[in-house]
Interface confidence: low
């Protein structure tokens, strides 16, 4: 099953997020991803748990998953680099770098997104954009076109309340509100963009979606700058 959904959002403006990637397994959308360099896509490590015997590829330049679009191109994956500390049973270090088989052909619809290097929390209440091709309702309808939603950042103390995530949100994670509007168990690997900069990657741990007491959890990319740089070097 695809790991991902945007709940309570709307269709994105076509090709307005040229960094957006669809990580695909055997030709079907599996996870979101974000182009961070000409030959590298950042996603979530857990996305590959379902991919043991399949062909993983990355779709760039897409709005519709099914319709022909001039900017769309599917790239093979030369190298998959999960964060060395990621583990199946935890949301910590849930990052994955995918090296494309060649440098992406850049253009208006395909462009890397600058990512945050300053390791400082995004201010609570900041509106951030999350996008993906995951299911759009609890009945499981999958969208063909990219969806997005704006979500306010939630402070870590609230997110760590016993009634919420009960202390699981480390300094390397951040939360966003989830009251009916939410990312969910996918869109996993997709970008959380604040002020035009990549701040977070949607984690792929399973949790209930759209419930305000279970905020969305995002891996803070700034906390992993050294690792990202070392892989991209």
């Amino acid at each position: 099953p695809p790991r991902g959904r945007i709940l309570g959002g709307r269709e994105a403006e076509a090709h307005a997020r040229p960094y957006m990637a669809s990580v695909q397994l055997n030709g079907a959308h599996l996870c979101g991803g974000v182009l961070v360099a000409e030959q590298w896509v950042l996603s979530a490590a857990h996305c590959l748990e379902d991919a043991a015997d399949g062909k993983v590829q990355v779709l760039l330049g897409a709005h519709s998953l099914s319709q022909p679009e001039p900017s769309k191109r599917l790239y093979d994956v030369l190298r998959a680099v999960p964060h060395p500390d990621s583990q199946p049973d935890t949301i910590d270090h849930d990052l994955l770098l995918l090296q494309l088989s060649e440098k992406a052909t850049l253009g208006p619809a395909v462009r890397p997104l600058p990512w945050q290097r300053v390791d400082r929390d995004v201010a609570p209440g900041t509106l951030c954009d999350v996008a993906g091709w995951g299911i759009v309702n609890h009945a499981g309808r999958r969208p063909d076109s990219l969806q997005h939603v704006l979500l306010p950042v939630l402070d870590r103390a609230t997110c760590n309340r016993r009634t919420h995530h009960d202390g699981a949100i480390t300094e390397r994670l951040m939360c966003a509100e989830s009251n009916r509007r939410d990312s969910c168990k996918g869109d996993s690997g997709g970008p959380l963009v604040c002020g035009g900069v990549l701040e977070g990657v949607v984690t792929s741990g399973s949790r209930v979606c759209g419930n305000r007491k279970k905020p969305g959890i995002y891996t803070r990319v700034a906390s992993y700058a050294a690792w990202i740089d070392s892989v991209l070097a």
Partner: antibody, heavy 120, light 107 residues
């Protein structure tokens, strides 16, 4: 020290099959794409096949497509090349090579090779 | 497929000389060009990757350069151990292709 050791070559009749193995050590095998390259006597190298580090991508040169299969067992640090419907023009020294990490494709370490002769 | 035209096919030079081998790609391959050395009876070994980057342990008398779709390998101050055949290889796209080789001999 990076070490690549091929085995499994030999004399085979046209139409026959062979399975080559490449045992590796000295590096984290699952981080690297791997390739098979062959070299016929007196000729230059010819790239044959590539497999990505977690086996999500495969490439073959056209002439072996459908006859050769590249695979890997990361738990055993081993690369394989299964060859069937062999032809006389497949006669060559077959090298296993590690694919470098610094961008597009090149082979940074090579094994000593295993000889394949296809003849009746 | 991308063709790699390598020249000369052979050359003879004296110890201490500087020699240049050229590889021309049939289409744009960016910087994705590698050079290998194969000593007689031995395996190919990587010298240079990404057009101009020296592989670990390769002496600094070897250097690589790119000009558009033409690439050069230069060996300065030729040493006896430099004899062998040199191959270029493009890594831009599959199938990966090699040049036909340049056999270097010492006068």
């Amino acid at each position: 020290e990076v070490k690549l050791v091929e085995s499994g070559g030999g004399l085979v009749q046209p139409g026959g099959s062979l399975k080559l193995s490449c045992a590796t050590s000295g590096f984290t095998f699952s981080d690297y794409g791997m390739a098979w390259v062959r070299q016929a006597p007196g000729k230059g190298p010819e790239w044959v096949a590539f497999i990505s580090n977690l086996a999500y991508s495969f490439y073959y040169v056209d002439i072996v497509m459908g006859r050769f299969t590249i695979s890997r067992e990361n738990a055993k640090n081993t690369l394989y090349l299964e060859m069937s419907s062999l032809r006389s023009e497949d006669t060559a020294m077959y090298y296993c090579a590690r694919v470098g990490l610094y961008g597009n494709f090149f082979m940074d370490y090579w094994g000593q090779g295993t000889s394949v002769t296809v003849s009746s | 497929d991308i063709q790699m035209n390598q020249s000369p096919s052979s050359l003879s030079a004296s110890l201490g000389d500087t020699i240049t081998i050229t590889c021309h790609a049939s289409q744009n391959i960016n910087v994705w060009l590698s050079w290998y050395q194969q000593k007689p009876g031995n395996i190919p070994e990587l010298l240079i990757y990404k057009a101009s980057n020296l592989h670990t342990g390769v002496p600094s008398r070897f250097s690589g350069n790119r000009s558009g779709t033409s690439f050069t390998l230069t060996i300065s101050s030729l040493q006896p151990e430099d004899i062998g055949t040199y191959f270029c290889q493009q890594g831009q796209s599959y199938p990966l292709t090699f040049g036909a080789g340049t056999k270097l001999e010492i006068k």
